[in-house]
Interface confidence: low
């Protein structure tokens, strides 16, 4: 008896979606496995007899619920299947965006992007898919505790009348008002002001 | 079991070339985005270069643009770095990592590896 897959799990990020599984414990020799994906009614073969741990379905429709499987197989002998159900524009993970920092004397400009997704064409982004998209920033000096959020209107945001000459961090993550989902922060900017642009009277 | 084996580095000279190679194995090598990473001696590791899954995008730390080229062959599950005008500044150990996540590049943002290789040493010296 061929024992199943294991710890079968959908690592999806930005609708790269990943299936992977661990290779069972298993004496007689090396486990080959087969990925399969329910398509009107029918199982079609993503990967076969393959000797990975992880199959990639990123070419599912983002929209609707879809049924993956996978057994192993060795020799003439296999698995029972082990079955997933994803919906990728439910589950899959929001990568954190880009973003550049630039200093202007006493503040910072920081420009957004939302995350690419890989499988489609080079401009489209999380943005096209989701119609709600809209970024979270935190900002803090740097050193200390405090955090201050602001949810920006456009790709773009000034964080003005800082106080000169000190370091402070800014990190953004995508957000979905009507889901209230969230996705993970980019990791920290951080960038010192300079001269107070104030003309002294 | 996953691998990521670096090969092609050595000692240089100024102005000199290398070729890098990473050969990856045990893993779906086309459905990952690569990167080259380096490390100098006594730093940290510094972002080199990245390209997606299917070799279409690239982008490079300003530090190597225009002398650096990255490119991979998914038929060979292989990644390379074309170096040239070599600089003593580039002297380093020089790791290929594989990312199930890769974003936009040139842009500040996380890049998180899921693979590894061992690193080979590229020495830039007179």
């Known amino acids: 008896m061929v024992p199943p897959p294991e710890n079968v799990r959908m690592n999806s990020v930005n609708f790269k979606n990943i299936l992977q599984w661990e290779s069972p414990a298993f004496a007689k020799g090396n486990l080959t496995f087969t990925a399969q994906y329910l398509s009107y009614r029918i199982f079609q073969d993503k990967c076969m007899n393959t000797t990975l741990t992880e199959c990639d379905f990123s070419s599912l429709s983002k929209y609707g619920d879809h049924t993956l499987r996978v057994r192993a197989e060795f020799a003439d002998e296999h698995s029972d299947w082990v079955n997933i159900t994803f919906c990728p524009v439910d589950d899959t993970i929001i990568g954190p965006p880009g973003m550049q920092v630039e200093v202007l004397a006493d503040s910072l400009h920081m420009r957004f992007l939302a995350p690419k997704i890989e499988n489609e064409y080079e401009t489209w982004t999380m943005k096209n898919v989701y119609n709600s998209w809209t970024y979270n920033v935190q900002y803090w000096k740097n050193g200390t505790d405090e955090k201050f959020q602001i949810t920006p209107q456009y790709d773009f945001e000034v964080l003005r009348n800082l106080e000169p000459w000190t370091t402070y961090c800014v990190q953004v993550r995508g957000f979905l008002p009507d889901r209230n989902k969230a996705g993970e922060w980019s990791e920290p900017v951080c960038e010192q002001t300079t001269h107070d642009e104030t003309v002294p009277s | 079991q996953v691998q990521l084996q670096e090969s092609g580095g050595g000692l240089v000279q100024p102005g000199g070339s290398l070729r890098l190679s990473c050969a990856a194995s045990?893993?779906?090598?086309?459905?990952?985005?690569m990167s080259w990473v380096r490390q100098a001696p006594g730093k940290g590791l510094e972002w080199v270069s990245q390209?997606?899954?299917?070799?279409?995008?690239?982008s490079y730390a300003d530090s190597v643009k225009g002398r650096f080229t990255i490119s991979r062959d998914n038929a060979k599950n292989t990644l390379y770095l074309q170096m040239n005008s070599l600089k003593p500044e580039d002297t380093a150990v020089y790791y290929c990592?594989?990312?199930?996540?890769?974003?936009?590049?040139?842009?500040?943002?996380?890049?998180?590896?899921?693979?590894w290789g061992q690193g080979t040493q590229v020495t830039v010296s007179s």
């Open positions: 390209i997606n899954t299917g070799g279409g995008s690239t």
């Open positions: 045990g893993f779906a090598f086309s459905s990952y985005g």
């Open positions: 990592a594989a990312s199930s996540r890769l974003y936009s590049s040139s842009w500040y943002g996380s890049r998180e590896y899921d693979y």
